[in-house]
């Protein structure tokens, strides 16, 4: 089992949309695949895929999950808020026929505030 995640770095504006993609490949067929997205180490969602369908379509705040055969798991954040910023990791495990797991590399998401003055205020608020 191998997992490739992208992009490595994603910078978007608050209120727009962010798309994170995870490519899951296995040399042999699988009956059930458990997938998981985490943000800064905390689990956002942990659905499974069987018969070509996800058991859950929601993944964290404003997150939508989709599976496109043969291998693409997509997490779409829409609309993006400032607290979506963080480090996202995709993990996958074949549960049936036999356990095998792998995870992707980190995607770092940076969300820029919609109001540029908000950005200036934030920067100015850091101690001297």
């Amino acid at each position: 089992l191998s997992v490739q995640q992208g992009p490595n770095l994603l910078q978007v504006r608050q209120g727009s949309q962010a798309t994170l993609v995870c490519q899951v490949d296995q040399a042999t067929a699988w009956e059930r695949l458990r997938v998981k997205w985490t943000k800064d180490g905390a689990i956002l969602c942990q659905p499974y895929i069987t018969n070509g369908s996800l058991s859950l379509g929601v993944c964290g705040p404003q997150g939508r999950l989709s599976w496109q055969a043969p291998s693409h798991l997509t997490l779409q954040l829409d609309p993006v808020s400032l607290n979506h910023s963080g480090a996202y990791v995709c993990w996958a495990a074949v549960e049936i026929p036999e356990l095998e797991e792998a995870e992707g590399n980190i995607t770092r998401l940076f969300v820029d505030p919609d109001d540029p003055t908000q950005n200036r205020n934030r920067i100015a608020s850091f101690p001297g």
Epitope: Q26, T28, A29, W30, P70
Partner: antibody
Framework: QVQLQESGPGLVKPSQTLSLTCTVS??????????WSWIRQHPGKRLEWIGY???????SYNPSLKSRVTISRDTSKNQFSLKLSSVTAADTAVYCC????????????WGQGTMVTVSS | DIVMTQSPDSLAVSLGERATINCKSS????????????LNWYQQKPGQSPKLLIY???TRLSGVPDRFSGSGSGTDFTLTISSLQAEDVADYYC?????????FGDGTKLEIK
């Protein structure tokens, strides 16, 4: 590009252990998503998958041979090896090593093969 | 184990004519999860190791002449050579990778009539 080369004795006595090594060049056997297999071709041309070792060192064997087979690796030499115990004349075959990836699940690179005869 | 049954055992076809080789699996090789058939076709010439032609039942490997094509789904698959060339004389094998153990068909010997 990746190349595979089998080596080992061409003649093994019945009841002994057949030992072969596959040396891989141009690619690391520890690369994520890759599997390193042994396949044999019997004199009648029949192809038989023996088993594989994957990038993490995990193995999978053909149940028909499982009790007699061990596949191991030496990452420092970029080699993987086959041991087949208690051989009989039925194990006489051309033994090949080959690689396969998760993403493209086919044997895309093969060694040239080495003939092993089991005879006293 | 999944049994792969190839037919015919041997085939003689005139140059420029169509050659058709069949492969039947003892269980379906199609996965609804990935929308793929886990079936490959190989060509083996005398003294050489097998060479991949077709993967996922119908995807031709880059560099393989377009006279080679694969079709079928589930349990029944076909390799077709649309116009036989002299260099196509070889043994042809189907192989599944739906699960372990991976198994091959017994091969079809293709000759020129």
């Amino acid at each position: 590009q990746v190349q595979l080369q089998e080596s080992g004795p061409g003649l093994v006595k019945p009841s002994q252990t057949l030992s072969l090594t596959c040396t891989v060049s141009g690619f690391s056997i520890s690369t994520s998503g890759y599997y390193w297999s042994w396949i044999r071709q019997h004199p009648g041309k029949r192809l038989e998958w023996i088993g594989y070792i994957n990038y993490g060192g995990g193995t999978s064997y053909n149940p028909s041979l499982k009790s007699r087979v061990t596949i191991s690796r030496d990452t420092s030499k970029n080699q993987f090896s086959l041991k087949l115990s208690s051989v009989t004349a039925a194990d006489t075959a051309v033994y090949c090593c080959a690689t396969m990836a998760d993403r493209f699940a086919f044997f895309d690179v093969w060694g040239q093969g080495t003939m092993v005869t089991v005879s006293s | 184990d999944i049994v792969m049954t190839q037919s015919p055992d041997s085939l003689a076809v005139s140059l420029g004519e169509r050659a058709t080789i069949n492969c039947k699996s003892s269980q379906s090789l199609f996965s609804s999860n990935t929308n793929r058939n886990y079936l490959n076709w190989y060509q083996q010439k005398p003294g050489q190791s097998p060479k991949l032609l077709i993967y996922h039942a119908s995807t031709r490997l880059s560099g393989v002449p377009d006279r080679f094509s694969g079709s079928g789904s589930g349990t029944d698959f076909t390799l077709t050579i649309s116009s036989l060339q002299a260099e196509d004389v070889a043994d042809y094998y189907c192989q599944h990778h739906y699960e372990t153990p991976l198994t091959f068909g017994d091969g079809t010997k293709l000759e020129i009539k």
